[in-house]
C-alpha cells in the first residue's frame, strides 16, 4: 500500500526558519505533489507549493524554495517571518498523485516540545483518492 | 479573446511610488495567475512575483521584495502591481503574463507599461 | 538562482534559411522551459513551451527540443516575419529565470 510521509524540522540555528520534507512510499510514478498548510489540499487547508516531476514549481507565501530532494520526495523551506516559531502548530500537509495509484495525503506538524534541529516523526494519515 | 490591457505610461520622480495595472478580459479572471515582469531597457526580462486572483496569494522574487507589492480587485478583474522608492534602475518596461497552470507557462501577455523615473 | 545562457546575443539568417538558437541551464531543469518571442516594440508572445510543445497557433516551422541543461528552438524555412528576439524561460526553480535573448536578423 502506498504511504505518504511528512516531516517539519526547525533549524537548530534559526528558531524562525522551518523546512518541510514530504515523501511517496510506493511502486508508482509521481504525476504531482501539492504542499498546503492549515489542513488538506481542498478541505480548509491554503495551497502552498505545487512540483511536477518534469515542469517545475509553482509557490506562494510563505513557501520560500519548493524543490525536488529524489524522485519520490521533495522539500519545501518556509520563509522566515522574524517570529520566534512562527508555525509551531501548524499543520502541513503533502498529497502525492501517483500513477496507478491515485491521490494519497498525509498530515504532520513539529511537536510543541521539539528541540531544535529535530523532524517531528513521520505522521502519515493516508487519504485516498481516486483521480 | 484573451487580453491582459496594462495601464499606460509613467513618468514618476526618485523616491516616489507608482502603481500599474493589469485588466484581464475574455477568461474567469479567478482561473489564473498573474506573474509580473520586467523588461531594461536593451536588457532581458526578470520574473518579479505572482499573484492568485482567487485567493490573494502571492510569492516574489527575492531581488524584488520590499519593491515590488502585488495585489488584486476581483470585483474589476484588474492586478496591480506597486513599486515603491523608484530610483533610475527601475525605469523599465513592466509586463503582466498569464499563467496556464494546465501547460505551465505564460499563455498571454500585457500590452506592458512603460516606467520612467526621472527627476 | 538557475542562470539561462543564451551564448548568441544576435543570429544572422536569411529567407528560407534554417537556424537554432541554443539555450543551456546552470542545472538541469528537466523540461521546465519555454521559448517567448519578442518582435520590436511589442510584448512577448509564447511560442513553444514543455520544452517542445508548440502554442496554440505557431507554425509548425517552429520546433523545440532538449531536456536537462541543453535546450535549442529551431526555426525552419525563415520568413521575414521571424524577425524578432528570442528568450527561453526556465520554470523549474523559483525564482523563474529567463535567458539574456538572441536577436534574429534577416539578411
Known amino acids: 500500500t502506498p504511504e505518504v510521509w511528512v516531516q517539519v524540522q526547525m533549524e537548530a540555528t534559526e528558531l524562525s526558519s522551518f523546512t518541510v520534507h514530504c515523501g511517496f512510499l510506493g511502486p508508482g510514478s509521481i504525476s504531482l505533489v501539492t504542499v498546503s498548510w492549515g489542513g488538506p489540499d481542498g478541505a480548509g487547508g491554503t495551497k502552498l507549493a505545487v512540483l511536477h516531476p518534469e515542469l517545475g514549481t509553482r509557490q506562494w507565501a510563505p513557501a520560500r524554495q519548493a524543490r525536488w530532494e529524489t524522485q519520490s520526495s521533495i522539500s519545501l523551506a518556509l520563509e522566515d517571518s522574524g517570529a520566534s516559531s512562527p508555525f509551531a502548530n501548524t499543520t502541513f500537509c503533502c498529497k502525492f498523485a501517483s500513477f496507478p495509484e491515485g491521490s494519497w495525503e498525509s498530515c504532520g506538524s513539529l511537536p510543541p516540545s521539539s528541540d531544535p534541529g529535530l523532524s517531528a516523526p513521520p505522521t502519515p494519515v493516508p487519504i485516498l483518492r481516486a483521480d | 479573446e484573451v487580453q491582459l490591457q496594462q495601464s499606460g505610461p509613467e513618468l514618476v520622480k526618485p523616491g516616489s511610488s507608482v502603481k500599474i495595472s493589469c485588466k484581464a478580459s475574455?477568461?474567469?479572471?479567478?482561473?489564473?495567475?498573474l506573474d509580473w515582469m520586467k523588461q531594461s531597457h536593451g536588457s532581458s526580462l526578470e520574473w518579479i512575483g505572482a499573484?492568485?486572483?482567487?485567493?490573494?496569494?502571492?510569492s516574489y522574487n527575492q531581488k524584488f521584495k520590499g519593491k515590488a507589492t502585488l495585489t488584486v480587485d476581483k470585483s474589476s478583474s484588474t492586478a496591480y502591481m506597486e513599486l515603491r522608492s523608484l530610483t533610475s534602475e527601475d525605469s523599465a518596461v513592466y509586463y503582466c503574463?498569464?499563467?496556464?497552470?494546465?501547460?505551465?507557462?505564460?499563455?498571454?501577455w500585457g500590452t506592458g507599461t512603460t516606467v520612467t523615473v526621472s527627476s | 538562482d538557475i542562470v539561462m545562457t543564451q551564448s548568441q546575443k544576435f543570429m544572422s539568417t536569411s529567407v528560407g534559411d534554417r537556424v537554432s538558437i541554443t539555450c543551456k541551464a546552470s542545472q538541469i531543469v528537466r523540461t521546465a522551459v519555454d521559448w517567448y518571442q519578442q518582435k520590436s516594440g511589442q510584448s512577448p508572445k509564447a511560442l513553444i513551451y514543455?520544452?517542445?510543445t508548440r502554442h496554440t497557433g505557431v507554425p509548425d516551422r517552429f520546433t523545440g527540443s532538449g531536456s536537462g541543461t541543453d535546450f535549442t528552438l529551431t526555426i525552419d524555412n525563415v520568413q521575414s516575419e521571424d524577425l524578432a528576439e528570442y528568450f527561453c524561460l526556465q520554470h523549474w526553480n523559483y525564482p523563474y529565470t529567463f535567458g539574456g535573448g538572441t536577436k534574429l536578423e534577416i539578411k
Open positions: 503574463a498569464r499563467w496556464d497552470s494546465n501547460s505551465w507557462y505564460f499563455d498571454v
Open positions: 499573484m492568485s486572483p482567487n485567493n490573494g496569494a502571492t
Open positions: 514543455s520544452a517542445s
Open positions: 475574455g477568461y474567469t479572471f479567478t482561473d489564473y495567475n
